[in-house]
Interface confidence: low
């Protein structure tokens, strides 16, 4: 993992998410990526917090939905989380999300 | 029921360890991003680490870089805190806190980025 | 860093009376997603705190509707509708668009 690396969540990722939680390494939290994002979290590797992805995400996290735009997935969405490896807070992977 | 419990504080004297340990339960563990969260006496919160659902991605706020380190075992459901090099100033109350990341549905991803279970948090005391 | 600046840091309010808490921050919040990850947190006398608003204005699962949160950009505001005794704590902002995670210095709701 990244012990410090950026100040925002990480970026984009270029892996599919994992279930509830977003993994990074970076210091800001992750831009948008480029595949769908898990239900639960994000998985990535930069320091920034990611950013939703541009695939479909996954189906359990939050019970309500935000007041801001979704950032919609182009593929099928994964289960909880999504898995990403930038600098900032993970964002979205490029590939397919998992299920759960 | 969702449910976090913190073990491993107590008092250590300047220069010593300690090992925080976080039991998870009721929930997917390996699924989130976990965090240790502080609070010195009578004082506000402070982050202190966090680490991505897998373990891979860790940081750490700059008054603990390089002494503390932050560690999970997905098997275990648990969350580690190992705290090298003690100082007055790293007495507090430490909070183990899921965060919710969001999740995707229908094509499309939210958002949300917000502590939603804390634990009751475990008292690290440093002091000669 | 981003820095959280809340204001009062005492309310002390009259049950049934309105309260009003301001966080603000050293520079804007807004994460290159377009979300805004902005956080209330009530921390009950003798225990952990207790997640409330998300994202500027959204209420948790089971706060009570007499807590919103409303703001943009770097200004932020949590208002109780009408206090009640149970809502007696220490209140804070938190932002999580980036590393490090920040916290107010919180803000203390306590009865006339």
């Known amino acids: 993992g990244v012990t410090s690396a950026p100040d925002t969540r990480p970026a984009p990722g270029s892996t599919a998410p994992p279930a509830h939680g977003v993994t990074s390494a970076p210091d800001t939290r992750p831009a948008p990526g480029s595949t769908a994002p898990p239900a639960h979290g994000v998985t990535s590797a930069p320091d920034t917090r990611p950013a939703p992805g541009s695939t479909a995400p996954p189906a359990h996290g939050v019970t309500s939905a935000p007041d801001t735009r979704p950032a919609p997935g182009s593929t099928a969405p994964p289960a909880h989380g999504v898995t990403s490896a930038p600098d900032t807070r993970p964002a979205p992977g490029s590939t397919a999300p998992p299920a759960h | 029921q969702v449910q976090l419990v913190e073990s491993g504080g107590g008092l250590v004297k300047p220069g010593g360890s300690l090992r925080l340990s976080c039991a998870a339960s009721?929930?997917?563990?390996?699924?989130?991003?976990m965090s240790w969260i502080r609070q010195a006496p009578g004082k506000g919160l402070e982050w202190v680490s966090y680490i991505s659902s897998s373990g891979t991605t860790k940081y750490y706020a700059d008054s603990v870089k390089g002494r503390f380190t932050i560690s999970r075992d997905n098997a275990k459901n648990s969350l580690y805190l190992q705290m090298n090099s003690l100082r007055a100033e790293d007495t507090a109350v430490y909070y183990c806190?899921?965060?919710?990341?969001?999740?995707?549905?229908?094509?499309?991803?939210?958002?949300?980025?917000?502590?939603?279970?804390w634990g009751k948090g475990t008292t690290v005391t440093v002091s000669s | 860093d981003i820095v959280m600046t809340q204001t009062p840091l005492s309310s002390p309010v009259t049950l049934g009376q309105p309260a009003s808490i301001s966080c603000r921050s050293s520079?804007?919040?807004?994460?290159?997603?377009?979300?805004?990850?902005l956080s209330w947190l009530q921390q009950r006398p003798g225990q952990p705190p207790r997640l409330l608003i998300y994202k500027i204005s959204n209420r948790f699962s089971g706060v009570p509707d007499r807590f919103s949160g409303s703001g943009a950009g770097t200004d932020f505001t949590l208002k109780i509708s009408r206090v009640e005794a149970e809502d007696v704590g220490v209140y804070y902002c938190?932002?999580?668009?980036?590393?490090?995670?920040?916290f107010g210095g919180g803000t203390k709701v306590e009865i006339k």
């Open positions: 520079q804007s919040l807004v994460h290159s997603d377009g979300n805004t990850y």
């Open positions: 806190v899921r965060e919710n990341i969001g999740y995707c549905t229908g094509g499309n991803c939210f958002y949300y980025y917000y502590m939603d279970v």
């Open positions: 938190m932002q999580a668009t980036q590393f490090p995670l920040t």
């Open positions: 009721g929930f997917t563990f390996s699924d989130y991003y």
